[in-house]
Interface confidence: low
């Protein structure tokens, strides 16, 4: 960007611009209009001769000169104002913007230039003088003015000199210009180098991330089996208990068989006398299958079953179809309890949701939906939802009617696009909608302008991403 | 329909002050998120502003933090554009738009007005 | 700041032709771009958001492409009509960042 341009304005005026980032400095140079060309009749360096001219001829010589004088003090004049005044805006903007090199120069070539315009005046000044005293007394000093208008040519030729020094100077300024572009760009170059190394470090820290996040996921796993190699023990002892206390009741009429109890959800739990927070093994409506779940005894009246908990970003949640299906995390964390699980529950029975959520302020608010129910896998666990009150949003954050659910591997929006993929996580997305609370974890300060993050729009508005969520369902007749 | 009517544009010195105005019909205005997008003669479009629908979120860009403010008034469905030490370099058309809910749009402006000229010149 | 660098500043095509107009992201934005058009006179309108996605009532002769940092857009068998300018923005943070226009003109 740095550049000089030298051209010619409309009126004739030599112009010099140098540009240089933001600054532009512009030498107009009035160009000698009345100075004659080489081609014109009379040569401003001809020898002189001795011999005495005519009158006449002597006259019409120094008027001649005379105008030639008067012209160039003309010229010198208008030079010397243009150089003032733009000298005064000129400094104002060097000092302002340009380099402390390029302001030292600036300054001296300005002081230069007006030492150099005073001097040239004052010599003038005097020549002017003399040629004046000299037309009075042309008769008698005819051999004596030969000599004087030798000396104002030649003083001529030296102010032509002086021109051509100060454009000397204007080239020595461009070299000086053009030289620092090209140490800008020699920086520049090595900034984009800079750069481009700590991209390479940063795509290495990424790989580095995505490794320990498998092994996190791989130690997820084998947590996971380790507790149900505990559960299955747990349930081995509970038989050889059971098979014991057959026995025994068999030879002793008295004692009572032991039933086992199941519950089916946190408030069977609750009213079963259990209203200590924690986990809890549930089991799937007329199955004996089980799935273990966290209980919130406290919020609310208790009995709540939670379905979905984000708190510090500990769990991917950009998970499958299937893993979204059968539950996925650790209960008294971060985990989805599963799809089908919710699915089957929420069809037996009239169920509310709670979804809790916390900003990275220290604000809370909550949505509460009356009804709350989601399809079979065959109708891709579609939410259900109705009466929504609460502080987050008079509006419903999942769209309404209720949509799909989609994943990565399951794309069941109504966008073009594949939204799972795109903000992350599965969620019932719409064409994407104004909610994901499975979306991308986001740390303190970097939770802003991001719109694959944890989303509840109609309490934060667009790409906030909130610091914890906590969904929640309990039976409506609780 | 969807429809944003700006006003408040006209003449300003350098210094100066002058508040636009832009109001909204056609959907729930405090629903959305709201922004200011400006053009200069002849240039390309610059974003300015952004409020979000509870005013809750505002953002500002570089060159006009601290000098301009934004603020709606959403029973009245009304965005606005306070503009104070104004520069010649603040002459342009002033659009405001609505952003879309869409999550996938992000800060998708779907919605624009027909913008209000303000010229800043002594 | 995220800069989007659009090329080219303005093109000449004959109607029916296709052009394709890109749009350079500093650094990446996934696919969280859009596209607008901008007739003299008149406010700008979105053609196309999430970088591939087509706004309500554009025709289906606009298509968009790419993530990351590289994005087009691509007009198909040119219209009177489409001989206007184009803008891209990045949708991805504040502040919001916009193309300095494409200027499409008839041959």
């Known amino acids: 960007y740095n550049n000089f341009r030298k051209s010619m304005d409309s009126i004739g005026k030599k112009q010099y611009q140098v540009q240089h980032g933001s600054c532009s400095y512009t030498f107009l140079l009035p160009e000698m209009d009345n100075c004659r060309s080489s081609s014109s009749p009379y040569v401003s360096n001809a020898v002189q001769r001795d011999a005495p001219l005519e009158y006449d001829d002597s006259v019409q010589r120094l008027q001649v000169l005379e105008n030639i004088m008067e012209n160039n003090t003309q010229w010198l004049m208008k030079l010397e104002n243009y150089i003032q005044d733009n000298m005064k805006k000129e400094m104002v903007e060097i000092q302002q913007n340009a380099v402390q090199n390029q302001t030292a120069v600036m300054i001296e070539i300005g002081t230069n230039l007006l030492n150099q315009t005073a001097e040239q005046t004052r010599k003038l000044t005097d020549v002017e003088a003399q040629v004046l005293n000299q037309t009075t007394r042309l008769e008698l000093q005819l051999l004596e003015h030969s000599l004087s208008t030798n000396k104002l040519e030649k003083q001529i030729l030296d102010q032509t000199s002086e021109i051509n020094k100060l454009q000397d100077k204007n080239s020595f300024l461009e070299k000086k210009v053009l030289a620092m572009e090209d140490k800008h760009i020699i920086q520049l170059q090595s900034i984009k180098e800079e750069k481009d190394q700590l991209q390479v470090l940063v795509s290495k820290q990424n790989s580095i991330i995505e490794e320990l996040e498998k092994k996190i996921v791989t130690a997820t796993v084998n947590n996971s089996v380790l507790q149900k190699q505990q559960h299955d023990l747990m349930e081995t002892v509970n038989n050889l208990l059971t098979m014991m206390s057959t026995s025994n009741s068999a030879k002793d009429p008295t004692v009572a068989k032991e039933e086992q109890i199941s519950f089916r959800d946190c408030a069977e739990v609750f009213k079963s006398g259990h209203t200590t927070n924690g986990i809890y093994t549930l089991t799937f409506p007329n199955s004996t299958e089980e799935i273990k779940a966290y209980c919130d005894m406290e919020a609310g009246g208790g009995g709540w079953t939670i379905i979905q908990r984000r708190e510090d970003g500990s769990v991917d949640f950009q998970r499958t179809w299937k893993e979204y299906k059968v539950g996925f995390g650790n209960p008294s964390g971060e985990y989805w309890l599963g799809n089908e699980f919710v699915s089957q529950l929420t069809n037996q029975q009239r169920y509310v949701l709670k979804i809790h959520l916390k900003d990275w302020e220290g604000n809370e608010a909550y949505s509460l939906y009356e009804h709350f129910y989601l399809s079979s896998e065959e109708l891709n666990y579609r939410i259900h939802l109705k009466g929504l009150t609460g502080t987050a949003g008079k509006i419903s954050s999942i769209s309404q009617p209720g949509n799909d659910f989609s994943t990565k591997d399951g794309d069941n929006d109504k966008c073009i696009c594949k939204c799972s993929q795109m903000l992350t996580g599965g969620w019932w997305f719409d064409a994407c909608g104004p909610s994901n609370l499975n979306g991308m974890y986001y740390p303190q300060r970097q939770n802003t302008n991001k719109f694959n993050g944890i989303k509840w729009y109609y309490w934060k508005g667009s790409g906030y991403s909130l610091k914890a969520t906590t969904m929640m369902i309990r039976p409506a007749d609780f | 329909d969807v429809q944003l009517v700006e006003s408040g544009g006209g003449l300003a010195q350098p210094g100066g002050s002058r508040k636009l105005s832009c109001a909204a019909s056609?959907?729930?205005?405090?629903?959305?998120?709201m922004h200011w997008v400006r053009q200069a003669p002849e240039k390309g479009l610059d974003w300015v502003a952004y409020?979000?629908?509870?005013?809750?979120?505002?953002y500002y860009a570089d060159t006009v933090k601290g000098r301009f403010t934004i603020s709606r008034d959403n029973p009245k469905n009304t965005l606005f554009l306070q503009m104070t030490s104004l520069r010649s370099e603040d002459t342009a058309m002033y659009y405001c738009?609505?952003?879309?809910?869409?999550?996938?749009?992000?800060?998708?402006?779907?919605?624009w007005g027909q913008g209000t000229s303000v010229t800043v010149s002594s | 700041d995220i800069q989007m660098t659009q090329s080219p500043a303005s093109q000449s095509a004959s109607l029916g032709e296709s052009v394709t107009i890109t749009c350079l992201a500093s650094q990446t934005i996934g696919t969280w771009l859009a596209w607008y058009q901008q007739k003299p006179g008149k406010s700008p309108q979105l053609l196309i958001y999430a970088a591939t996605s087509l706004a309500d009532g554009v025709p289906s002769r606009f298509s968009g492409s790419g993530s990351g940092t590289k994005f087009s857009l691509k007009i198909s068998s040119l219209q009177a009509e489409d001989f206007v300018s184009y803008y891209c923005q990045q949708l991805y943070s504040i502040p919001l960042t916009i193309g300095a226009g494409t200027k499409l003109e008839l041959k």
């Open positions: 738009a609505r952003e879309s809910t869409m999550i996938t749009m992000g800060y998708v402006l779907d919605y």
């Open positions: 056609g959907f729930t205005f405090s629903n959305f998120g």
């Open positions: 409020i979000s629908s509870g005013s809750d979120t505002i």
